[in-house]
């Protein structure tokens, strides 16, 4: 059996070397001499040498300073063999623990750290963690054992100690309140690691720590108070610009300015903001009117983007606004008047009063009208007072200026401003209906066969309005109904049947027709009827002499 | 504060007239225009005229044979007159200041309305 | 006569919910004078006079909440209230005073869902 006490071998040993370590035996060396000899990492397989063995005494022996950071346990078998080379013993395994000394220091993982934290964060508040490691022992000895500590802190403001290490983690947190990003940005901490639990073996590195906006700082007007002025009836019209300052992080949520009107409940106002600058651009809504309100008195707020992280005054402006007067035109009351009129209206007599305001109120200025437009030229306005007048008949009938029994003229007011100004206003005449036509037939030229002939319809018209319209009475005068008759076409009256009472020779006849409407108002007209050497329904034909009251008389 | 408050007859007998008194306060009826509209039971608005400050009137053509306005500017009155009425001018009737302010800016919608007086035209 | 059309006759609406009713006049509202829309939006809640909400067609009357909107030009009009609440359960008129005579929409009845 082989007797092999526990081997260790301190790492970094002074020489001499070869040193003893322990000596191998086996128990069979009683009965013969045995030779000794060992395999493996560090005797015959690399590194090799590192250990040897007296083949007869079976010390065992270390050859050079051991690395335990390289080699921390070596493995070898034993081997005793008798004189013959006879194994006498089945190999043995021997470890050998290189046991640590405190040869490495900490190492951070990294020279620069970096780490961020919001303004006015509360102690107690992680920032980062910061790590070093350690290449010696950490399970059997101290030599690993790593303590961080805060060696610097730049700037020392608003106190030297803002942050603490946890000794055993590295985790940073904030120990001081006081953060403000727009006082100091960045911190620069010289941190150390250390082991022995900080009594041993340090190394240095630098934590930096960005202290990242929140919105602690309101906008500030700078100035508070503005002018500007702005002419009336014009909207998208820049009126002045707002200045701001922020503190906070430029082109953020937390600097980006909302500017606010406190006192605009019409809706008169707007304000934008330059997202360059961060101004704010005040323009009207809509259009102002001096003649209501010459001045106005803004008080606008600010505030920003995202709400303040803690209670901050709200700033505000006062900004005055004067509205500039100019001159406008004058205005019809209401822009389209309807006026209902009889066209039998008479010539020189006053239809209706048309007038305009002028919203220069306080111009005092004098409005004058005229007719603008008056295509049948049957109006006259007086020019101070926008009486309107008939100058000659009115004629509903009139279709060429008549739509729908309306007539359209346009009036214009210009007043003595500078420059005149010139409104318009439409007048419509809606010219009810008297019996001022009587009916006429349609058509007036009538052709029949000499053979045959087949009867005429001749259409009653009438350019009236019922009731001064069909049914309508026909009647043939002059001696007329000697050779013709007539006869009703349909209930309404509104078209007749002419026809021959005879055969009639080949000429032109006149023919004398009384038309009458509904109101018994009465038209004697003269048919022009030519009878034509054909049969049947007739064509046009040649004129021959008119024959008086259905006569022929001879050319 | 302005009030329009309008008393009328409440019934009104086929064939015969309509007299409505529209009493005003809180504005001038020299400066102010005064319009009529009536609302028939259920149904939409009818324009049926108007009164301006200077006594100018304005009638709804279709109505202007039956209808007349006059008013007593000293005793802040408007007076609604109609004649031949039948059932379908049963109806509320309303008196309405129209804005006017300032020349024109304001123009001529109806801001004040009387709480109106119930017509039925019923034998 | 200009004739004013309301649609729809009837909008049901939850409240909280934004309601929007449309006008059309048979012709132009729009003055050339003064660039006005001679267009009116009034409110009758029931057994009550009209309220006048809105002139010149965006105008809101002095007392009206924000919530009520007019917008429009020439012949197309709305009014939209952004939130409703239950107290806006009326007919809605408009008017328009650019001709006499003067007419009215047939209304728009908004009911709260």
């Known amino acids: 059996d082989w007797v092999i006490p526990p081997i260790s071998c301190p790492e970094n040993e002074k020489g001499p070397f070869p040193k003893n370590l322990v000596q191998i035996k086996s128990n069979k060396d009683k009965e013969g001499k045995v030779f000794y000899s060992i395999t493996g990492q560090g005797a015959d397989t690399p590194p090799v040498g590192v250990f040897i063995i007296e083949r007869e005494t079976g010390w065992l022996k270390v050859t050079e300073p051991l690395d335990r950071e390289r080699i921390a346990t070596y493995t070898l078998f034993s081997h005793a063999v008798s004189s013959n080379g006879n194994a006498v013993e089945d190999p043995m395994e021997i470890l050998i623990t290189v046991t640590d000394q405190n040869d490495n220091k900490p190492e951070f993982t990294q020279e620069v750290f970096k780490g961020s934290v919001m303004e006015g964060a509360l102690p107690g508040t992680s920032v980062m963690e910061v790590t070093a490691t350690d290449a010696d022992d950490d399970v059997n000895t101290y030599n690993a054992a790593i303590a961080y500590t805060i060696l610097s802190q730049d700037p020392e403001l608003p106190d030297k100690n803002m942050f603490t290490i946890n000794r055993n983690t590295g985790v940073i947190s904030v120990v001081t309140t006081g953060l403000d990003r727009e006082s100091f940005p960045t911190y620069t901490l010289v941190v150390q690691a250390a082991d022995l639990q900080g009594e041993g073996l340090s190394t240095t590195a630098t934590a930096v720590i960005t202290v990242t906006d929140t919105n602690d700082n309101p906008p500030i007007f700078n100035p508070t108070t503005y002018k500007g002025q702005v002419p009336e009836n014009e909207a998208n019209v820049v009126i002045t610009t707002l200045k701001v300052t922020d503190a906070d992080a430029p082109n953020t949520p937390a600097w980006e300015a909302v500017y606010t009107i406190l006192n605009d409940d019409g809706g008169q106002f707007v304000v934008t903001t330059n997202p360059v600058n961060n101004d704010g651009i005040l323009k009207t809504a809509k259009g102002l009117d001096f003649e209501a309100k010459q001045q106005y008195i803004l008080h606008v707020a600010v505030t920003n983007v995202v709400p303040f992280e803690v209670s901050l005054t709200t700033s505000t402006a006062t900004v005055t606004v004067d509205v500039l007067d100019v001159n406008e035109a004058p205005i019809f009351v209401p822009p389209e008047k309807r006026v209902e009129v009889s066209e039998d209206f008479g010539v020189g007599q006053e239809i209706t009063s048309y007038t305009a305001q002028e919203p220069d109120t306080f111009m005092e200025q004098k409005i004058t009208y005229r007719i603008w437009r008056d295509t049948a030229n049957w109006l006259e306005i007086n020019p101070d007072t926008g009486a309107i007048s008939t100058r000659a008949e009115l004629d509903r009938e009139d279709f060429e200026h008549v739509k729908n029994s309306t007539y359209t003229a346009l009036i214009i007011a210009t007043d003595n401003g500078s420059p005149v100004a010139t409104g318009t206003g439409t007048l419509l005449l809606i010219l009810s209906d008297v019996n001022d036509n009587a009916p006429i037939p349609e058509p007036r030229t009538i052709f029949f066969c000499e053979r045959n002939p087949k009867p005429q319809v001749i259409n009653i018209i009438d350019a009236d309005l019922p009731p001064n319209t069909s049914p309508f009475t026909a009647e043939l005068t002059h001696g007329a109904s000697a050779n013709w008759t007539i006869q009703y076409n349909d209930p309404t009256q509104e078209s007749i049947i002419l026809k021959p009472k005879m055969a009639l020779e080949v000429g032109d006849y006149k023919i004398n027709l009384k038309l009458m409407d509904n109101q018994n108002k009465d038209q004697v007209t003269t048919l022009e009827v030519s009878v034509c050497d054909c049969e049947g329904a007739a064509g046009v034909c040649r004129k021959a002499q008119p024959v008086e009251a259905g006569l022929q008389i001879p050319a | 504060q302005v009030q329009l408050k309008e008393s009328g007859p409440g019934l009104v007998a086929p064939s015969q007239s309509l007299s409505i008194t529209c009493t005003v306060s809180?504005?001038?009826?020299?400066?102010?225009?005064v319009h009529w509209v009536r609302q028939p039971p259920g149904k939409g608005l009818e324009w049926l005229g108007m009164?301006?400050?200077?006594?100018?009137?304005d009638y709804n053509s279709g109505l202007k044979s039956r209808l007349s306005i006059s008013k007593d500017n000293s005793k802040s009155q408007v007076f609604l007159k109609m004649n031949s009425l039948q059932s379908d001018d049963t109806a509320m009737y309303h008196c309405?200041?129209?804005?006017?302010?300032?020349?024109?800016?304001?123009?001529?919608?109806?801001?004040?309305w009387g709480q109106g007086t119930s017509v039925t035209v019923s034998s | 006569d200009i004739v004013m059309s309301q649609s729809p006759s009837s909008l049901t609406v939850s409240v909280g919910e934004k309601g929007t009713m449309s006008c059309k006049s048979s012709q132009s509202l729009l003055y050339s004078s003064n660039q006005k829309n001679y267009l009116a939006w009034y409110q009758q809640k029931p057994g009550q006079s009209p309220k006048l909400l809105i002139y010149?067609?965006?105008t809101r009357e002095s007392g009206v909440p924000d919530r009520f909107t007019g917008s429009g030009s020439g012949t197309d009009f709305s009014l939209t209230i952004s939130s409703v609440l239950a107290e806006d359960l009326a007919v809605y008129f408009c008017h328009q005073y650019y001709s006499s005579p003067y007419t009215f929409g047939g209304g728009t009845k908004l009911e709260i869902k």
């Open positions: 309405v200041r129209a804005q006017f302010y300032y020349g024109y800016d304001g123009g001529y919608a109806m801001d004040y």
């Open positions: 009164i301006w400050g200077g006594g100018s009137i």
């Open positions: 010149w067609a965006s």
């Open positions: 809180g504005f001038s009826l020299s400066r102010y225009s």
